[in-house]
């Protein structure tokens, strides 16, 4: 070993070196949170880049760059360090037009903390392992969601467009003439029934157990879907999103109430099955796989 390499190894294995890097990363993170940093922080930025460059040089000199088995670039954690340094020099010395987009990559410096803290390294390692192991569960989840999305598509397509429409029109007005002239929210409220505080017209249905319209209103299928058109089963993709919402239980009770009001109470069976299978079973299966991967990583 050359004297330079020996010195690099000594520095690399020294605990103070890890401490220095750790403190540098944390200080850098603090500086990154500044809203309007003063001019002198530019020099501090250069200092950080210098320390990171020094750290990488020490690692390269001690371990070699990329040829051997345990060299610098053979460790995925060092790829992060390498990218951080490359982007630091790129944003500083190369004029690449939209620099603010490249500045985003400075946030990667915060991720360097992971490679320094051993506990964090274990957790992230487990996370990466779990993602690999999750592929089968993900395929199963997507398959189940797709099947139920197709069922939802068949059962509820267009149902969430059912609205309570005012019966007492002017003599020359028709549903079509009104829909062609409606522009503002105010216009809509004039012809459709809205519950107090609601941003969408009252939903209704044509089956006996679905929601009925109040006196003076009749159920029609017209206009857009609720929630600015985002809640529907009209296409496979929207149905898939709705099912994903059910699986993650993201304000699912609203979707449940909307659909049951438009389609009928009988369809609660569909929601019971989806919540039990998607939300309780599949979510817990995913958690189990993550827990197993973490356990393996710990051992």
């Amino acid at each position: 070993f050359s004297p330079l390499r020996r010195i690099s190894i000594k520095i690399l294995v020294h605990s103070l070196f890890s401490m220095l890097i750790m403190c540098t990363i944390l200080t850098n993170c603090i500086f990154m949170t500044m809203n309007n940093p003063p001019d002198w922080t530019k020099n501090v930025e250069y200092t950080f880049t210098g320390i990171y460059t020094f750290e990488s040089l020490v690692k390269i000199l001690a371990r070699g760059f990329c040829v051997g088995e345990f060299t610098f670039l053979r460790d995925p954690w060092n790829w992060l360090d390498f990218v951080v340094i490359v982007f630091a020099y790129l944003t500083e010395f190369v004029n690449l037009g939209n620099v603010s987009a490249l500045r985003t990559f400075r946030v990667l410096r915060a991720l360097k903390t992971i490679s320094v803290i051993p506990g964090l390294k274990t957790i992230v390692g487990a996370l990466i392992q779990s993602v690999k192991k999750l592929s089968d569960v993900m395929i199963l989840t997507v398959f189940c969601l797709s099947v139920f999305a197709l069922i939802g598509l068949q059962l509820f397509m267009g149902n969430l467009k059912h609205k309570c429409f005012r019966n007492s029109l002017e003599n020359n007005e028709t549903l079509e003439s009104i829909m062609n002239t409606l522009e503002s929210e105010e216009d809509f409220r004039k012809y459709f029934y809205y519950l107090e505080g609601s941003k969408d017209a009252l939903l209704c249905g044509f089956s006996t157990d679905s929601g009925q319209c109040p006196e003076g209103y009749t159920c029609v299928k017209i206009g857009r879907n609720p929630d600015y058109g985002y809640t529907s089963f009209d296409t496979f993709s929207w149905a898939f999103l709705a099912l994903f919402r059910l699986m993650t239980q993201d304000y699912w009770e609203n979707l449940y109430q909307q659909t049951l009001r438009a389609a009928g109470k009988t369809y609660m069976i569909f929601f019971v099955v989806v919540i039990f299978l998607g939300s309780f079973y599949l979510i817990n299966l995913i958690l189990a796989v993550v827990a197993m991967a973490y356990e393996e990583q710990n051992q």
Partner: nanobody, 124 residues
Framework: EVQLVESGGGLVQAGGSLRLSCDAS????????MRWHRQGAGKQREFVAR???????DYADSVKGRFTISRDNAKNTVYLQMNNLNPEDTAVYYC??????????????????WGRGTLVTVSS
């Protein structure tokens, strides 16, 4: 496809009575309002009477007290009972309805449908 068919028109003496009916057919889920309109020779089409699905009624001033609109929801039919007819009532009477029906491929559509009309002639 939804169809509205008017019937009951014909020739009647002034002061006489007629009962028009309008039958809606097709895969109908709900009929909202149903209206009668009329169009005399060389005149604009004018509103005559309306009935909503909860049986609220409304009439044009010219026919108030003489005409009565009613409906049979089970049969998807609307009736117009015309009493004390006079020559000014001579026109083609059209039926209009706001219908929600199951159309091609089982999808649901709401729209305004019109009949082809039935001629009522009142002679003096």
């Amino acid at each position: 496809e939804v169809q509205l068919v008017e019937s009951g028109g014909g020739l009647v003496q002034a002061g006489g009575s007629l009962r028009l009916s309008c039958d809606a057919s097709g895969r109908i889920l709900r009929i909202g309002y149903m209206r009668w309109h009329r169009q005399g020779a060389g005149k604009q089409r004018e509103f005559v009477a309306r009935i909503t699905d909860d049986s609220a009624t409304d009439y044009a001033d010219s026919v108030k007290g003489r005409f009565t609109i009613s409906r049979d929801n089970a049969k998807n039919t609307v009736y117009l009972q015309m009493n004390n007819l006079n020559p000014e009532d001579t026109a083609v009477y059209y039926c209009e309805a706001l219908v929600t029906a199951s159309v091609r491929g089982g999808s649901i559509h709401s729209g305004t449908y019109w009949g082809r009309g039935t001629l009522v002639t009142v002679s003096s």
